[in-house]
Each structure stands twice: as structure tokens, then as C-alpha cells.
């Protein structure tokens, strides 16, 4: 029997490589049974997670799961970093794994390691 607790299914150790200037949607998969919980996004700053107020968010419903989406329109260089979603459910705070955005600023892309360099220097992948 599946649990009726709220579950936040951001993938553990997930990463997104995105370009500054592009639109991007960061999804928080949410499983719930009856009432949809109140979900928020925050951005990690050291050990604290700063709540993202006044940011465009929306819900998308799919079969068996819903998504609470944080919209980046467009992505800015300082959007680089780690994000987490959290839900209030029966006076409990449920926190997701964090997910990391690696933002490439197209203006300085030439200074960044190429795909070939990444392949020949695999330790660059373990940031």
C-alpha cells in the first residue's frame, strides 16, 4: 500500500546545464493523495536555503504526479547554484533533495572548458 504522505521527488544529485538568456523551467515533482500541499522553492546559500519570493511559479498535472515549476524567464548568470523545494503537510515541513543549475554565460562561454577538454579531464565533471 503506497504511503499517503507528501513526497517531493527531485532527483538526488541532479544537475542541469543551462544557458543564460534562455527560458528554463525547474520542476519539483510532487506526490500527494487528497489536498495539494503548499510548496515553495528556495535557493541554497551555504547551509541556509533562502525562500524565493516574487518568482513566477506554476503547477502542471500529470497522471499520478504533479509538478511545481519555478520559471526562469530568462536564465540569468546569478541563477547558478543549488535549489530545493519544500512542502507543508499536516504541519510537517518536507524538503526535497537539492538540484544544481550550472549556468553558462554565453558572453564568457569561450573561457569555459570545451566538451573535448571535459572528456580528456574527467575530474572536471566532479564539481
Amino acid at each position: 500500500k503506497e504511503s499517503c504522505d507528501v513526497q517531493l521527488y527531485i532527483k538526488r544529485q541532479s544537475e542541469h546545464s543551462i544557458l543564460a538568456g534562455d527560458p528554463f523551467e525547474l520542476e519539483c515533482p510532487v506526490k500527494y493523495c487528497a489536498n495539494r500541499p503548499h510548496v515553495t522553492w528556495c535557493k541554497l546559500n551555504g547551509t541556509t536555503c533562502v525562500k524565493l519570493e516574487d518568482r513566477q511559479t506554476s503547477w502542471k498535472e500529470e497522471k499520478n504526479i504533479s509538478f511545481f515549476i519555478l520559471h526562469f524567464e530568462p536564465v540569468l548568470p546569478n541563477d547558478n547554484g543549488s535549489y530545493r523545494c519544500s512542502a507543508n503537510f499536516q504541519s510537517n515541513l518536507i524538503e526535497s533533495h537539492s538540484t544544481t543549475l550550472y549556468v553558462t554565460d554565453v558572453k564568457s562561454a569561450s573561457e569555459r572548458p570545451s566538451k573535448d577538454e571535459m572528456a580528456s579531464r574527467p575530474w572536471l565533471l566532479y564539481r
Epitope: 513526497q7 532527483k11 515533482p29
Partner: antibody
Framework: EVQLQQSGADLVKPGASVKLSCTAS????????AHWVKQRPEQGLEWIGR????????KYDPKFQGKATMTADTASNAAFLQLSSLTSEDTAVYYC????????????WGQGTSLTVSS | EVVMTQTPLTLSVTIGQSASISCKSS???????????LNWFLQRPGQSPKRLMH???KLDSGVPDRFTGSGSGTDFTLKISGVEAEDLGVYYC?????????FGGGTKLETK
């Protein structure tokens, strides 16, 4: 029911490349990670790497970097492992493994694909 | 990379007897999220591996409660209280805290 169906056994010549497939049913690959695990005859298990089918992001064990390339296609709910410049060292069973919602806990295993590299 | 060392290599038991397998990691497997990503798998002859235990001590669905997992940091143990014939095979520990993820070398559980 969650199932991972892997492509059939393959016999290939040294120096060639091969692409193994893994098709998921009972869940959406987009919401999971797909891992690949190698097992040489009478040997233990080796983690090759994992792919996030939602965005193509990959992580490899450095010893498989350049040998293995993982890809995924969310439209067909499938993950793929390409192995290049094959040698007898690549003779093994390759397992496709999926996580429950990207938990990184290796929840569901395919039946394995036996690859033999021989001239 | 994190090295996972399993002992013993082979464990010969009588059916009904208890068995214990040790797994040691070269560094602590406690993740920053407070969880320890240590799993145990059983591979029966001719079959795919099957997960028995995740996050050190959480028993997987359908796995009998004669299996118990314990440990923390770098030292982990899988205990089987009263081995049954269906328990025979090769047991692997695995860490998913650090990239690259790594398996232990395996412990073969066989009958005397």
C-alpha cells in the same frame, strides 16, 4: 508493474562498437535515473555510470570515460549504452538499472545483456 | 574513489545457521543530507542482482525479516538469522554517497 527489458545477447568483433538498449515499462524514465552496471564472467559488479533521461546529464566512473557513452530517449522510454573500440575485456553482462524517482538507490534491474567480444 | 571491502570472500554455512557479512568503506558514507547510501544486493546463480536492503537497514519489499542491516560511517554488517536455501548466492554491498558509485567485491554464501 515496473520492468526493464534489455536487448538480446550480442557477439561482436574486436575493434567494433555496440549499442545496448533498455526499455522501461510501468514508469516514466524521465522521472528516474538510468544506471549501467558491468559484470565480467565470474567477477563482481562495476558501476559504469548513470544518465538523467530528462536532460541527458551523465556521470561516469572515470575508468569507463571514453569507452562507454550513455544516452536516453524519453519518447521511447529507453536508455542506451554504446561501447566503442571493443576488446575481450568488454566481454561481460551489462545490466540496466533504474531508480525510484531518482533516489540513486538502484531499485529496479533489467535481465542483463550478454556481450561477447571475439574474432 | 571509495573502496568497499567485503569479508569474508566465501562463507560456508549449514542451513538454519546464522551468517554475517562485513563491508567496510574507505571513507564515511554519511551524506550531507543525513542519510547513508549503503545498499546490500543478492545475486543468485544465473540471475540479476536483487536489492535486499537500502539506506543501511531498510528492508526491501518482499525480503524476509531474517535479514538485518546495521552499521554507520565506514563499517556495515548484513546478518542472516537462520539461512535458508534460497539465500545462497553472492552478496554485494554498494555505496551511492560519492561519485563514482562503487560495489564491494562480493561474498559468496554457500552450504557446507
Amino acid at each position: 508493474e515496473v520492468q526493464l527489458q534489455q536487448s538480446g545477447a550480442d557477439l561482436v568483433k574486436p575493434g567494433a562498437s555496440v549499442k545496448l538498449s533498455c526499455t522501461a515499462s510501468g514508469f516514466n524514465f524521465k522521472h528516474t535515473y538510468a544506471h549501467w552496471v558491468k559484470q565480467r564472467p565470474e567477477q563482481g559488479l562495476e558501476w559504469i555510470g548513470r544518465i538523467d533521461p530528462a536532460n541527458g546529464n551523465t556521470k561516469y566512473d572515470p575508468k569507463f570515460q571514453g569507452k562507454a557513452t550513455m544516452t536516453a530517449d524519453t519518447a521511447s522510454n529507453a536508455a542506451f549504452l554504446q561501447l566503442s573500440s571493443l576488446t575481450s575485456e568488454d566481454t561481460a553482462v551489462y545490466y540496466c538499472v533504474a531508480d525510484h524517482y531518482g533516489s540513486s538507490l538502484l531499485d529496479y534491474w533489467g535481465q542483463g545483456t550478454s556481450l561477447t567480444v571475439s574474432s | 574513489e571509495v573502496v568497499m571491502t567485503q569479508t569474508p570472500l566465501t562463507l560456508s554455512v549449514t542451513i538454519g545457521q546464522s551468517a554475517s557479512i562485513s563491508c567496510k568503506s574507505s571513507q564515511s558514507l554519511l551524506d550531507s543530507d543525513g542519510k547513508t547510501y549503503l545498499n546490500w544486493f543478492l545475486q543468485r546463480p544465473g540471475q540479476s542482482p536483487k536489492r535486499l536492503m537500502h539506506l543501511v537497514s531498510k528492508l526491501d519489499s518482499g525480503v524476509p525479516d531474517r535479514f538485518t542491516g546495521s552499521g554507520s560511517g565506514t563499517d556495515f554488517t548484513l546478518k542472516i538469522s537462520g539461512v535458508e536455501a534460497e539465500d545462497l548466492g553472492v552478496y554485494y554491498c554498494w555505496q551511492g554517497t560519492y561519485f563514482p558509485y562503487t560495489f564491494g567485491g562480493g561474498t559468496k554464501l554457500e552450504t557446507k
